[in-house]
Amino acid sequence: EEELQVIQPEKSVSVAAGESATLNCTATSLIPVGPIQWFRGVGPGRELIYHQKEGHFPRVTPVSDPTKRNNMDFSIRISNITPADAGTYYCVKFRKGSPDVELKSGAGTELSVRAKPS
């Protein structure tokens, strides 16, 4: 059985303030069953940005239909980017459980925010 990998192809993404940012993430396997979550940062302050299964994230939308069978694209789009959104974002695969268990993290994508073009 091939080991699950979580791939974030871009090391960095630069977006102008007010635009949308697309953060790409794919998984190499559907197994084991469990959600993908997106976080900003690592350690104690790690901030939940998007949860595939629960929560309310008004500025974040999945790029691909998460309900589609065999979907392995977990990319997200964050709308109306501001300088406060800068940081390193991680796509993380969890195994379903109570609670869910973290399995594998992508390498991270650093989002930088450029000034709005005048």
Epitope: F39, R40, V42, G43, P44, G45, R46, E47, G87, E102
Partner: antibody, heavy 117, light 108 residues
Framework: DVQLVESGGGLVQPGGSLRLSCTAS????????MSWVRQAPGEGLEWVSA???????YYTDSVKGRFTISRDNSKNTLYLQMNSLRAEDTAIYYC???????????WGLGTLVTVSS | EIVLTQSPGTLSVSPGERVTLTCRAS??????IAWYQQKPGQAPRLLIY???SRATGIPGRFSGSGSGTEFTLTITSLQSEDFAVYYC??????????FGGGTKVEIK
């Protein structure tokens, strides 16, 4: 406005237990890391424990195995269960919201824990 | 563990003076330093993060600078409400997060 309100402090004997609570409002609690920071009388600040937005837990060495941090996202509440308390645990315990890059942007007013016989 | 050393321990100054507080780290922390102000009987308040970024609502007289292992907090013209204890905190290595011992700024 972000508000953090601690409760549960008090006087306890060495070896005893206490559970601190921190009720949060003004932000989406479940998405953010939360922490406990303490300050012994007349001393500086010491980070004690944290629970990240993913529910991972972290402790400073001196409390590992004695303190347990937990959270109830449905109640917007952070807890610190303190067991086997020692005199050196006497301090004001502050609840603080942790930013994504690990500093503290909002603090509660603190609750005093006194460990004495 | 990253150890932060603040100096001086106490600073006696007059209102209107310029004040510079120093925080030294035991190893490089890539500019990941925060500064807090604490007045007697109050909780700490975030002033500066990422060495030089002012937190929301913090007056322009507070500024931070530094890189590598040496960082400074400067208050350009000390106001009466600025007499307090100031702490630095590194947010580079979170195992564990550590604070400096504090600098007390008192009225001369």
């Amino acid at each position: 406005d972000v508000q953090l309100v601690e409760s549960g402090g008090g006087l306890v004997q060495p070896g005893g237990s206490l559970r601190l609570s921190c009720t949060a409002s003004g932000f989406t609690f479940r998405n953010y890391g939360m922490s406990w920071v303490r300050q012994a009388p007349g001393e500086g600040l010491e980070w004690v424990s944290a629970s990240s937005g993913s529910g991972s837990t972290y402790y400073t060495d001196s409390v590992k195995g004695r303190f347990t941090i937990s959270r109830d996202n449905s109640k917007n509440t952070l807890y610190l269960q303190m067991n086997s308390l020692r005199a050196e645990d006497t301090a004001i315990y502050y609840c603080a919201k942790v930013t994504w890059n690990n500093f503290f942007d909002y603090w509660g007013l603190g609750t005093l824990v006194t460990v004495s016989s | 563990e990253i150890v932060l050393t603040q100096s001086p321990g106490t600073l006696s100054v007059s209102p209107g003076e310029r004040v510079t507080l120093t925080c030294r780290a035991s190893q490089g922390i890539a500019g990941k330093i925060a500064w807090y102000q604490q007045k007697p009987g109050q909780a700490p308040r975030l002033l500066i993060y990422d060495a030089s970024s002012r937190a929301t609502g913090i007056p322009g007289r507070f500024s931070g600078s530094g890189s590598g292992t040496e960082f400074t907090l400067t208050i350009t013209s000390l106001q009466s409400e600025d007499f307090a204890v100031y702490y630095c905190q590194q947010h580079y290595d979170w195992s564990p997060l550590t604070f400096g011992g504090g600098t007390k700024v008192e009225i001369k």
